[in-house]
Structure formats: structure tokens, C-alpha cells
Amino acid sequence: CKAMHVAQPAVVLASSRGIASFVCEYASPGKATEVRVTVLRQADSQVTEVCAATYMMGNELTFLDDSICTGTSSGNQVNLTIQGLRAMDTGLYICKVELMYPPPYYLGIGNGTQIYVIDPEPCPDSDF
């Protein structure tokens, strides 16, 4: 396993609809054709997998149908979007990139993007 540098923004604020987008950039040492991207969430020293996708360079990322993540790739960069976030989902979201093929296998883990989620205030009752 060889190490690889991964960069991601430090902080992102989710939208009022619970959507957060961030970029994950990796230094590809060679011409990888198959890349796996995993988003991990770290909160209270617990790490859980949020979503993962494997894609062929030049193609779209394909997450599972029930995934809360979507994404696109461009060169050595992945644009990730996480939906359905609530205040309790605030935490550090870590981008993990693996160059699966061709060998050698490379692994890179970013420092994480702190995503802040604020639940919207409920609308007051109205007579209108």
C-alpha cells in the first residue's frame, strides 16, 4: 500500500435544505483507471462510513440507489454532495481515496471537512 496526498476544504456549511457539497482532490502518482472514493464521518471519536463509490476515470461516480451521496469527477478531483443532513449530522467528513487499478494500490485520506448543519426554524402558524 502506497500513500497518496488528499486535500479537502476545512469547513462547509450545509444549506437550509440539509445539502452540503465539498471537493476532494488527490495526487494521482500514475494513470489510475479505477478509483474508489469513500466518505467517512467522524464524531465523538466514532468513525462511520457515509457512502462509497467506485468509478472509472472519465465516468460518473455511481453510488448505491439509497445513498445520501452524489458526485462527479473531473481529473484528479471529486465533487461530492451529501443530502438529507440534519443538525445531529454535524461532524468531520473525511474523504478517502483509493487507486484500485492498475497496480500499485494507492491509499489517501484527507484531513476532513467539518460540515455544520443547522436545522431550519419551523415556520410559524399563519392564518393565510
Epitope: V6, A7, E25, G75, N76
Partner: nanobody, 127 residues
Framework: EVQLVESGGGLVQPGGSLRLSCAAS????????MGWFRQAPGKEREFVAA????????YYADSVKGRFTISRDNAKNTLYLQMNSLRAEDTAVYYC????????????????????WGQGTLVTVSS
């Protein structure tokens, strides 16, 4: 509005080294690709090197590959260009430039993709 201020230029003998710095004001420095360009007397401004927003990927003109190293310190909002084995043909005014879109993946050497420029710092290589 972000300001870019270059420093570190000067007179150096052939074979010598210099380190240029570009200090950026504002809090969005880490979101943008950055580049170094140069303009020699009587010539067009040309691409020297570029670095991605996260500092992960770097790009060089063939003429400086193996001699120049671009780097950045996002915590200090500063871009660097380490120049070794300098030659007379490296004499020029060196400009730093900020990419036009945050978190871009364009990785371009084209001047049109850079939105902001510093005033430049003069590097003279002569014995």
C-alpha cells in the same frame, strides 16, 4: 478583494538560487489554484508553474522542470517559487496569479483562467 504581493526577487549569479513569495490577503486563498508567470524584456508573459488549491498537484513549464518548485502554505496565505540552477534566460519579472474559480479542476496554464495578478518582482540572472 484579494491582494497579491510578490517578494524575493533580486540579482543572482548563474547557477544560483532564489525563493519568491506571494502573500495574499483575504480568507479565500486556500480555495483557489495559484500560478507563477514571467515576462522577460521584450517578450510575452509566459506560464512558469501552477499549483492546485489543495497543494496536491503541481504543473511546470518544460523550461523550468527540475529546476523550479512551486509550493503553498494555506495557513499563511502564501505562495512560493523556489528557483534553483538559474540561467540568464530566467531573467524576467515574475508574477503570481490567482485562479478564477474556487476549487477548480481546470489546471490551466492559460493566462485567461487567472482572475487576479500581483504587481510582479524582478529577477535578474547575471554574472
Amino acid at each position: 478583494e484579494v491582494q497579491l504581493v510578490e517578494s524575493g526577487g533580486g540579482l543572482v549569479q548563474p547557477g544560483g538560487s532564489l525563493r519568491l513569495s506571494c502573500a495574499a490577503s483575504g480568507r479565500t486563498f486556500s480555495s483557489y489554484d495559484m500560478g507563477w508567470f514571467r515576462q522577460a524584456p521584450g517578450k510575452e508573459r509566459e506560464f512558469v508553474a501552477a499549483i492546485s488549491w489543495g497543494g496536491v498537484n503541481t504543473y511546470y513549464a518544460d523550461s523550468v522542470k527540475g529546476r523550479f518548485t512551486i509550493s503553498r502554505d494555506n495557513a499563511k496565505n502564501t505562495l512560493y517559487l523556489q528557483m534553483n540552477s538559474l540561467r540568464a534566460e530566467d531573467t524576467a519579472v515574475y508574477y503570481c496569479a490567482r485562479g478564477s474559480a474556487p476549487y477548480s479542476s481546470s489546471r490551466s496554464s492559460a493566462q485567461e483562467t487567472y482572475a487576479q495578478w500581483g504587481q510582479g518582482t524582478l529577477v535578474t540572472v547575471s554574472s
